[in-house]
């Protein structure tokens, strides 16, 4: 979802090893070593160059910056702070750059930053103030509209001794800086749960992608405040059933489209309300593809074709009658 440049001439800069000793900021048409630049497209690409830090001499005209496929490791505070500021930078793609730490204030001094893609980086340490830049209880609003955080979960052995979900949510909520966020992608992060307060504090969301996680339940998640939500991707999770409260909230969102494919739906008596709702609702895309995973006798049955007689629960035996 990051912009790509239109076909236009890219100038590239030969690598140089001398230290940057200057009396003035970079010339407007200067292109950093190991990068390709197009002033016409306002685009700089420093892609697959094994860079270990953000180039210091980025041209002031840059609107779209691609720093993908590098070895940045750490994004320090003020990583993009320049004099003059990179006032035009609107889209920043850092995906696949081996980032494992993003520090507080990493994106400060980027007043026009609308899209940020940190996908495919093993973020073991994402500062709570990575996006807000301040530890104030209410920070200056971030200009971010799209935040792409797909597959940022680090390997198990590199995780801190804290909940990964909690770390990500803390960064999303700090200082209430992301009130203007419209697109949030959190796919493929092994999320087991969604902290209950996260969505309530992102009221501008239009698109939320939580696909390919390990979400088992949405019982404690409220979608009620997300009145602008247009798409909710929940494919490829571990959802067993959606309960009445969730169904009612989703139905109450005026523009919503929900994607629920490839979840292990449990087709027992608890599924009755959801089946009834599915038959009536227009909000679920591809609802005819939803099938049961459990119990065994129901496997691959299409949810829309079930009726209440199909959805039974085995009686719970009193303890005296249970066999070991």
């Amino acid at each position: 979802s990051s912009p790509t440049s239109s076909a236009s001439s890219f100038s590239s800069s030969a690598p140089f090893l001398a230290s940057a000793v200057s009396a003035q900021p970079p010339l407007p048409d200067q292109c950093p070593a190991l990068c390709e630049c197009s002033e016409a497209a306002r685009t700089v690409k420093c892609v697959n160059r094994n860079l270990t830090e953000v180039p210091t001499d980025l041209p002031a005209y840059v609107r779209n910056l691609f720093l993908t496929g590098n070895q940045l490791a750490v994004l320090p505070a003020g990583a993009f702070a320049r004099r003059p500021p990179l006032a035009e930078l609107a889209a920043l793609n850092l995906s696949g750059s081996r980032l494992d730490e993003v520090r507080a204030g990493a994106f400060e001094h980027l007043p026009s930053l609308r899209q940020l893609d940190l996908s495919h980086n093993p973020l073991a340490d994402l500062s709570p103030f990575a996006f807000s830049g301040s530890n104030a209880s209410v920070s200056a609003p971030s200009p971010l509209v799209e935040l792409i955080l797909n597959h940022i979960v680090p390997p198990e052995d590199e995780r801190q001794n804290r909940s990964f979900e909690g770390m990500v949510v803390a960064a999303l909520l700090a200082g209430r800086a992301l009130q203007g966020l419209r697109r949030l992608e959190l796919a493929s992060n092994h999320f087991l749960y969604l902290p209950r307060d996260v969505l309530a504090q992102l009221p501008s969301l239009r698109h939320l992608d939580l696909s390919n996680n390990s979400l088992v339940s949405l019982t404690y998640v409220s979608f009620r405040n997300l009145t602008h939500l247009e798409s909710l991707h929940l494919e490829d999770n571990a959802l067993k059933v959606l309960h009445n409260g969730t169904l009612a909230e989703l139905q109450g969102l005026p523009h919503i489209r929900v994607f629920l494919d490839n979840n292990p739906w449990v087709c027992d008596c608890h599924m009755a309300d959801m089946v009834t709702w599915l038959k009536e609702t227009e909000v679920v895309q591809g609802k005819d593809r939803l099938t049961c995973a459990y119990p065994e006798k129901m496997r691959n049955r299409v949810l829309l074709e079930l009726n209440s007689a199909d959805l039974d629960c085995d009686p719970i035996l009193p303890p005296s009658l249970q066999t070991s």
Epitope: S19, P25, T56, A77, G78, R82, R83, P85, A87, P111
Partner: antibody, heavy 121, light 111 residues
Framework: EVQLLESGGGLVQPGGSLRLSCAAS????????MTWVRQAPGKCLEWVSE????????NYTPSLKDRFTISRDNAKNTLYLQMNSLRAEDTAVYYC??????????????WGQGTTVTVSS | DIVLTQSPASLAVSLGQRATISCRPS??????????IHWYQQKPGQPPKLLIK???NLESGVPARFSGSGSGTDFTLTISPVEAEDTATYYC?????????FGCGTKLEIK
């Protein structure tokens, strides 16, 4: 507590050289950009030069870059300013300064007390 | 280079009254989110002390009687009410571009 202590000032003849030092303590010197600012008697403050933590990025005020050289020794927690071909107009109090953040300076929270350089015959 | 013009060059204000100091950069030093102007206080024989960063953000430990405002090419430092200890010279500084530059100061005297 952050402390910056300048030394090396003194009286020097026109055309002579001096090397100023700024000894830093109370913080991780190797993380911070460092800056020299000077103030001629009764005059404005003038930004002189700055150096980034690993000495790879150095900036000077244009009129001084041919005569002044900034450097640092992170092992010794010390910032330097080598001043050559000194002129009467270089007479000033020289301050070293540090921002509160560890990226390129926008403002300066911490200042030394200054060392006085007098260029006179 | 960006030239910062401070006015007045000197100012005498009665104790408890309001002091207003102007700083005008020769070009805009503001983005949509930040203005790159900072204010310092300097007393005789001492180094400058940061009062306000980014035009309006009070540095920690600085009394709330100091405030800053403005954007683009017009900035103001206000001290209200003025106290005796505020006798000093006040400088603005821009960090929009290299070289960083300072204004030539406003000397405040308390009557």
């Amino acid at each position: 507590e952050v402390q910056l202590l300048e030394s090396g000032g003194g009286l020097v003849q026109p055309g002579g050289s001096l090397r100023l030092s700024c000894a830093a303590s109370g913080f991780d010197f190797s993380r911070y950009w460092m800056t020299w600012v000077r103030q001629a008697p009764g005059k404005c403050l003038e930004w002189v030069s700055e150096i980034n933590p690993d000495s790879r990025t150095i900036n000077y005020t244009p009129s001084l870059k041919d005569r002044f050289t900034i450097s640092r020794d992170n092992a010794k927690n010390t910032l330097y300013l080598q001043m050559n071909s000194l002129r009467a107009e270089d007479t000033a109090v020289y301050y070293c300064a540090r921002p509160d953040h560890d990226y390129n300076p926008y403002y300066f929270n911490y200042w030394g007390q200054g060392t006085t350089v007098t260029v006179s015959s | 280079d960006i030239v910062l013009t401070q006015s007045p060059a000197s100012l005498a204000v009665s104790l408890g009254q309001r002091a207003t100091i102007s700083c005008r950069p020769s070009q805009s030093v503001s983005t949509s989110s930040n203005s790159y102007i900072h204010w310092y206080q300097q007393k005789p024989g001492q180094p400058p002390k940061l009062l306000i960063k980014y035009a309006s953000n009070l540095e920690s430990g600085v009394p709330a009687r100091f405030s800053g405002s403005g954007s683009g090419t017009d900035f103001t430092l206000t001290i209200s009410p003025v106290e005796a200890e505020d006798t000093a010279t006040y400088y603005c500084q821009q960090s929009w571009e290299i070289p960083l530059t300072f204004g030539c100061g406003t000397k405040l005297e308390i009557k």
